[in-house]
Interface confidence: low
């Protein structure tokens, strides 16, 4: 019969013959022949392969380096890589999470729109009219100006995006 030009799913072509791929978590030891099947071996400790494959070496699990602010979010198996995340107060610098940086703080005049996670930084927004932030913070939102009227007071000093209004008593001397 004619040698195949394509193989079935979970097979690969070698020496004009289709051989079974190794299952996830195992590496290739030797290709099949017509009298012996593909030989595969399980990946070792701290190694993985996450696909049906013909790799002769397993990949090393990612190392979550604490010196870079990293910690293990999910321990790797023979079929999955280790997932790293950042320590509290830090976030990943990339999707691969190879290192961490401190969460950004929102300066005075800006409030936190979205609090940072292990994989995304703080998102800040300028405080709109009627709101202010007088601190540099990674958690504080813009606060609304104090309503002097509800306290039966009057505005003595207008608020800004960085300062609250200053309220004072009403001037009762005028008739």
């Amino acid at each position: 019969p004619e040698p195949p030009t394509a193989c079935r799913e979970k097979q690969y072509l070698i020496n004009s013959q289709c051989c079974s791929l190794c299952q996830p978590g195992q590496k290739l030891v030797s290709d099949c022949t017509e009298f012996t099947e593909t030989e595969c071996l399980p990946c070792g400790e701290s190694e993985f392969l996450d696909t049906w494959n013909r790799e002769t070496h397993c990949h090393q699990h990612k190392y979550c380096d604490p010196n870079l602010g990293l910690r293990v979010q999910q321990k790797g198996t023979s079929e999955t890589d280790t997932i790293c995340t950042c320590e509290e107060g830090w976030h990943c610098t990339s999707e691969a999470c190879e290192s961490c940086v401190l969460h950004r703080s929102c300066s005075p005049g800006f409030g936190v729109k979205q609090i940072a996670t292990g994989v995304s930084d703080t998102i800040c927004e300028p405080c709109p009219v009627g709101f202010f932030s007088n601190v540099s913070s990674a958690f504080e939102k813009c606060h609304p100006w104090t309503s002097c009227e509800t306290k039966d007071l009057v505005v003595q000093q207008a608020g800004t995006n960085k300062t609250d209004v200053v309220c004072g008593p009403q001037d009762r001397l005028r008739a």
């Epitope: 195949p4 193989c7 079935r8 079974s20 190794c22 017509e34 012996t36």
Partner: antibody, heavy 126, light 112 residues
Framework: QVQLVESGGGVVQPGRSLRLSCAAS????????MHWVRQAPGKGLEWVAV????????YHADSVKGRFTISRDNSKNALYLQMNSLRVEDTAVYYC???????????????????WGQGTTVTVSS | DIVLTQSPLSLPVTPGEPASISCRSS???????????LDWYLQKPGQSPQLLIY???NRASGVPDRFSGSGSGTDFTLKISRLEAEDVGVYYC?????????FGQGTKVEIK
Amino acid sequence: QVQLVESGGGVVQPGRSLRLSCAASGFTFSSYGMHWVRQAPGKGLEWVAVISKDGGNKYHADSVKGRFTISRDNSKNALYLQMNSLRVEDTAVYYCVRRGHQLVLGYYYYNGLDVWGQGTTVTVSS
Amino acid sequence: DIVLTQSPLSLPVTPGEPASISCRSSQSLLYSNGYNFLDWYLQKPGQSPQLLIYLGSNRASGVPDRFSGSGSGTDFTLKISRLEAEDVGVYYCMQALQTPRTFGQGTKVEIK
């Protein structure tokens, strides 16, 4: 019909050589991997060697490695086992065996060792 | 190398009665394509071995349906539903997953 016939056995002294032959008929010999399996008197079956259909791949049991060589001649539909430096423990009936398979889309689906010869007796004795 | 251990080594059976032989492997014979690479062979007195079962549970051509193979991974069983006089002989399991091929020690089935 499908048949394997071994020949070449006999009585031989330790250290001497012998060449076993296996004549295949009734099937396309060049499409099959072939094995030699032996059986010492009153003992179980022991695998000896295997050769791929084109003769490109060969494996031998550790017990015979370096002394025995499996080979084939597809033009003659013949399998061979060259046995050198024979030992008393090589005394056995030697069987020529076909590795059955079913070829589907290039993949050899194993069907067992489906055809066995009648065996040829090798006696190594001083 | 893979080691196969058969039990029992001797099995006297009354004709018409069932018989069961076990074969245990030192490592899994379940391959990634879903097949168990274990065969069963019968060697009748004075004859060459013959194939009974391949890939764990597939009966070879011409083998009566009173023979059946089962099991997966490391534990396998050959069953004869009703023993007949012509079934006597030595039964061997063999792993076909790796080279070198290895056989069990054999189980001698005889008439009780």
